[in-house]
Each structure stands twice: as structure tokens, then as C-alpha cells.
Interface confidence: low
């Protein structure tokens, strides 16, 4: 399990993003999003934390500058966090880079990744 410190770190990066998970994980049987408010999924929190860190690390987001920052973003913090961070970046670095270069907010990027649990997604 992730440590309380991990969640504290995540919350610190979430002040603007607030409080329930807008992506809501899965679509209902008719294609409508399920509308119950959910706690933020851990993956969603991880995403916001990492994307906001990356934003701070690059002045002007370009493919190269974001890619360079991505190699460093998981180096700080406790080892449990570093593992979580590296696993996330392995899966989603290309989308995160694309979003940052395009000027998307952390919330837009992470919401669009549908990282609440379970991430069923469409075809």
C-alpha cells in the first residue's frame, strides 16, 4: 500500500484540481458516464502530481524539453513513489508529453486518460 506521505504529496498538488474524480472511470451501459461522485482514484492523483511536477520543470514545453524532464521527474521522493511514478510514465509518457506541448492543463490530460478505477474505456 502507498504511504500516507504519498497521499499528502498528491494532495499538495491537487489544490486547484479538486475533489472528486471528473473522469468517473467508466461509461454506463448507454454510453453515458456514471455520475456518482467518487473519491479521486490513486492513478488520477498520480497523474496530476506528475504532470504538475513536469510543468514546473519546463519553462516552454516542447517535445524535447518535456521528454528531458520526464527522465528526471521520478527521481525524487520515497522509493514507493518513485516506482509508482516510473510505472505511470512507462504507460503514459507519450500522451502526457503530447498534452503538455499542446498547452493542456494537468486536469485535462489526466481526466482524458480516464484514470479512475477501473479504466474500462471504449473500443
Amino acid at each position: 500500500r502507498l504511504s500516507p506521505e504519498y497521499y499528502d504529496l498528491a494532495r499538495a498538488h491537487l489544490r486547484d484540481e479538486e475533489k472528486s474524480c471528473p473522469c468517473l472511470a467508466q461509461e454506463g451501459p448507454q454510453g453515458d458516464l456514471l455520475t456518482k461522485t467518487q473519491e479521486l482514484g490513486a492513478d488520477y492523483r498520480t497523474c496530476l502530481t506528475i504532470v504538475q511536477k513536469l510543468k514546473k520543470m519546463v519553462d516552454k514545453p516542447t517535445q524535447r524539453s518535456v521528454s528531458n524532464a520526464a527522465t528526471r521527474v521520478c527521481r525524487t521522493g520515497r522509493s514507493a513513489w518513485r516506482d509508482v511514478c516510473r510505472n505511470f510514465m512507462r504507460a503514459y509518457q507519450s500522451r502526457v508529453t503530447q498534452g503538455l506541448v499542446a498547452g493542456e492543463t494537468a486536469q485535462q490530460i489526466c481526466e482524458d486518460l480516464r484514470l479512475c478505477i477501473p479504466s474500462t474505456g471504449p473500443l
Epitope: 467508466q26 461509461e27 503514459y92 482524458d112 477501473p118 479504466s119 474505456g121 471504449p122 473500443l123
Partner: antibody, heavy 117, light 112 residues
Framework: QVQLQQSDAELVKPGASVKISCKAS????????IHWVKQKPEQGLEWIGY????????WYNEKFKGKATLTADKSSSTAYMQLNSLTSEDSAVYFC??????????WGAGTTVTVSS | DIVMTQTPLSLPVSLGDQASISCRSS???????????LHWYLQKPGQSPKLLIY???NRFSGVPDRFSGSGSGTDFTLKISRVEAEDLGVYFC?????????FGGGTKLEIK
Amino acid sequence: QVQLQQSDAELVKPGASVKISCKASGYTFTDHAIHWVKQKPEQGLEWIGYISPGNGDVWYNEKFKGKATLTADKSSSTAYMQLNSLTSEDSAVYFCKRWNYGYFDVWGAGTTVTVSS
Amino acid sequence: DIVMTQTPLSLPVSLGDQASISCRSSQSLVHSNGNTYLHWYLQKPGQSPKLLIYKVSNRFSGVPDRFSGSGSGTDFTLKISRVEAEDLGVYFCSQSTHVPWTFGGGTKLEIK
């Protein structure tokens, strides 16, 4: 990297059942749904349904209810699809796939099922 | 179920030409969340389909910029600005706004 390895081709008799597998590797199996898609020779694609191994949720295309049964074994990171009461209409290639909203799209190589007496 | 109608069924082109494939849905594909879940795939013989474009106009990772998607509501288009040999195969559109998620019948891009 993420891979979905499907079981080998099957030749089965009309009326029989077949169970095909899709073994996932390179990611946490319980984090993402596995979808199944049917493709008849030289034809289009049909979505059969999906299973969420994390919580056991299964959604089916109404057309395949009773025909397909989706299951998953977390211990072996393997999804299964059983097809029942087979007819020649069920002869097709069946693909499993993992999808994560467009940014991560991985398909198995497909399993060919041939129904013939 | 949403019916996805692709035209043409077959599209003969010369290498270097522009190609355009149309996909029309029987109902609007605008989701209640504002997104339009219309995607394009390419399938080569003996292979599984590969995602090219997701949500109307977003190129999937690694897809060359000669591929572009456009459209809204019920009418969508995939354009290839300069066809290369590796682009030949069957193109499918797919919608995931409404369950069951459905595919077009396919358009075969082939050499003239």
C-alpha cells in the same frame, strides 16, 4: 512492454463449445478491461463485450449474450472467452484487446475458430 | 445499434495521391460529456487492426502526420495526404459513444 498473447487456432464441431485465452503481460492485469472483438473472413469487426478483471464487471453486446461468456483469472493474468453452441456463423477470428482511451491500444494477434463437421 | 456506413468500399489510388474515406453514423456520436468517440483503424492482411486516429482528429502515438481526421455529429472523414505503400489495407471507423460499440464495414485502400 504490454502484450496480449492469444491461444492457438481451434477446429471444432457444430454444437460444441470452445474456450479461447488471452494472456496479458507487461502491466497490472487488474487495472484495465479486456475487450473481445469478432471478425469473420473478409468482413468487418463486431464488439462482443469486455471484462474488468479488477472487479469482475462484464458487459456484453446484446447480440452475444448467451453465445459468449467472458471470464478472467487474476492469478495467471489471463482472460478467457467461451463460445457455446457453435455454428458456422461463429467461424471467425477473435481478437482480445486492451484499450485505455486512445492513448494505449494493444491487440492480441487473434485466434481463428473454425466450426466444421 | 448505431450503424456506421463507410464509403467508398474500395479506393484505388496511386502512390503519392491524396485519399479520403467517409464514415457516417446513424445517430450523433456526440457523448453527453461533450466528447465525440469516433476512431479510425487500419488493418493489414493477417494482422490485428491498428489505431490511427482517436476521438475524431487525434493522431495515435507514432502515426505519421499525413493522416488526419475531421468531422462532427454524424459525418466524419479520414484523409491521407500522400499515400505511401505502407498505407495500403482496410480502414475501419469505429464509434464508442453508444453501447454496443460498432464499426464501419471497412474501406480497402489499394493501388490503381
